[in-house]
Interface confidence: medium
């Protein structure tokens, strides 16, 4: 009875909820529920009945496999979906699918907290800002990943004469998407700018605007 499957999908996508095993032979009835008591669709006597719900017009049942197709899922569709099958014997069997719908992560903005020349080296403190999301961070210096232990929203590093990383990329990701933001330096220790934009390596994630601390303070989190 406790078949529970987890699925994580990106919002806006089309999703198929199905079970990995065959349905009981010649079952009498099949019902999909949203949470425990909200019926979405029921198959009985060779026809499907769709119930009034937020899914109406967005779902389709395949009685052969029991698969439920949902189009254009949104975060509000997060729930445990239950498929109950009534066997010929009168016994019920159920399967549960826990669906998590996540929005794609937004493109991060790299904020220059500090940049300064010292000891003939260049000190950098960067923060990777995205509005109120729970994400994973990965930092790269010229595509070289920084150690996993430093993967949070802030990177501080010192460039020495034989350390030539010039472009710094923050990659933010959740389990369904990832986006990059990149800033670049001109040796020894100045931002590479073009019309007040930070030039970035094309293959590492597009341009990043140079914006002020005031613009960002309400987004900034560590």
């Amino acid at each position: 009875q406790g078949h529970l499957v987890h699925m994580t999908v990106v919002s806006g996508s089309n999703v198929t909820l199905n079970i990995s095993e065959s349905l009981p032979e010649n079952y009498k009835q099949l019902t999909w529920f949203y949470t425990f008591d909200q019926k979405i669709v029921e198959w009985d006597s060779r026809k499907s009945k769709y119930f009034e719900s937020k899914f109406k017009g967005r779902v389709r049942l395949d009685p052969q496999s029991g698969a439920l197709y949902i189009s254009k899922v949104q975060k509000e569709d997060n729930s445990t979906y239950i498929m109950r099958v009534l066997k010929k014997t009168g016994n019920e069997q159920e399967w549960k699918i826990k669906l998590q719908v996540l929005d794609p992560v937004p493109k991060p903005v790299i904020k220059i907290e500090k940049i300064e020349d010292m000891d003939d080296n260049c000190y950098l403190k960067l923060s990777c800002v995205i509005p109120g999301e729970s994400v994973n961070y990965t930092w790269y210096g010229d595509k070289r990943p920084f150690p996993k232990e430093l993967q949070n929203s802030v990177l501080e590093t010192t460039l020495m004469p034989h350390n030539y990383s010039r472009c710094y990329t923050c990659q933010v990701s959740n389990s369904v998407s990832s986006k990059n933001g990149t800033v670049c330096l001109s040796p020894p220790c100045t931002l590479a700018r073009s019309e007040q934009k930070l030039i970035s390596e094309e293959d590492l994630g597009g341009e990043q605007k140079l914006i002020s601390e005031e613009d960002l303070h309400h987004h900034h989190h560590h």
């Epitope: 990943p145 150690p147 996993k148 560590h222």
Partner: antibody, heavy 118, light 108 residues
Framework: EGQLLESGGGLAQPGGSLRLSCAAS????????MSWVRQAPGKGLEWVSL????????YHADSVKGRFTISRDNSKNTLYLQMNSLRAEDTAVYYC???????????WGQGTLVTVSS | EIVLTQSPGTLSLSPGERATLSCRAS???????LAWYQQKPGQAPRLLIY???SRATDIPDRFSGSGSGTDFTLTISRLEPEDFAVYYC?????????FGQGTKVEIK
């Protein structure tokens, strides 16, 4: 060129504690990520701990996690390693080093010997 | 974690000879992010080579690094008396950073 000088090594009993220090000179200390690397007698090098320039990020190797704590006092240009619940296998020369852009270690201090024995 | 295996364990050579030290990784080292260090008895290690083939500051040009993927080499073209020491490789392509067990270059 910066210089690093470790101190605080010595003899400790199993289960005991020691605190190592690394004094830096000739650099703007608070701007550099730092690391401790150790070398057991007659053995190779093993990375132990790291700390970012501000002290905001720290990390420890699995072999010392929960027992060792890296910290720094940038006003004193000093790096620390607090070593608790010491074991015989922690016996080693402990080096502090600048963790150059989190890639390689350069320069290094001269090392301080920690011996754990009853 | 990436395991680095250095060979030979000991290399017995005479001054003026060429030394070839090997460092083999258990899996490919990302973008050849490998460094070499020299350690003399009673001293701290010193950085020689980074990014597999770039010489660190003030390192003589008789030291050279090469290789890619899983196989890397440190070559000392003509051994000087001060080159007899232990040499370590270290990878920084993935966490945790790891070292090889060392190769001792001794006077024959």
């Amino acid at each position: 060129e910066g210089q690093l000088l470790e101190s605080g090594g010595g003899l400790a009993q199993p289960g005991g504690s020691l605190r190592l220090s690394c004094a830096a000179s000739g650099i703007t200390f608070g701007r550099y990520a730092m690391s401790w690397v150790r070398q057991a007698p007659g053995k190779g090098l093993e990375w132990v701990s790291l700390i970012s320039g501000s002290g905001g990020s720290t990390y420890h190797a699995d072999s010392v996690k929960g027992r060792f704590t890296i910290s720094r006092d940038n006003s004193k240009n000093t790096l620390y390693l607090q070593m608790n619940s010491l074991r015989a296998e922690d016996t080693a020369v402990y080096y502090c080093a600048i963790y150059n852009n989190y890639n390689w270690f350069d320069p290094w201090g001269q090392g301080t010997l920690v011996t754990v024995s009853s | 974690e990436i395991v680095l295996t250095q060979s030979p364990g000991t290399l017995s050579l005479s001054p003026g000879e060429r030394a070839t030290l090997s460092c083999r990784a258990s899996q490919s080292v990302s973008s050849n992010y490998l460094a070499w260090y020299q350690q003399k008895p009673g001293q701290a290690p010193r950085l020689l080579i980074y990014d597999a083939s770039s010489r660190a500051t003030d390192i003589p040009d008789r030291f050279s690094g090469s290789g890619s993927g899983t196989d890397f080499t440190l070559t000392i073209s003509r051994l000087e008396p001060e080159d007899f020491a232990v040499y370590y490789c270290q990878q920084y392509g993935s966490s945790p950073r790891t070292f090889g067990q060392g190769t001792k270059v001794e006077i024959k």
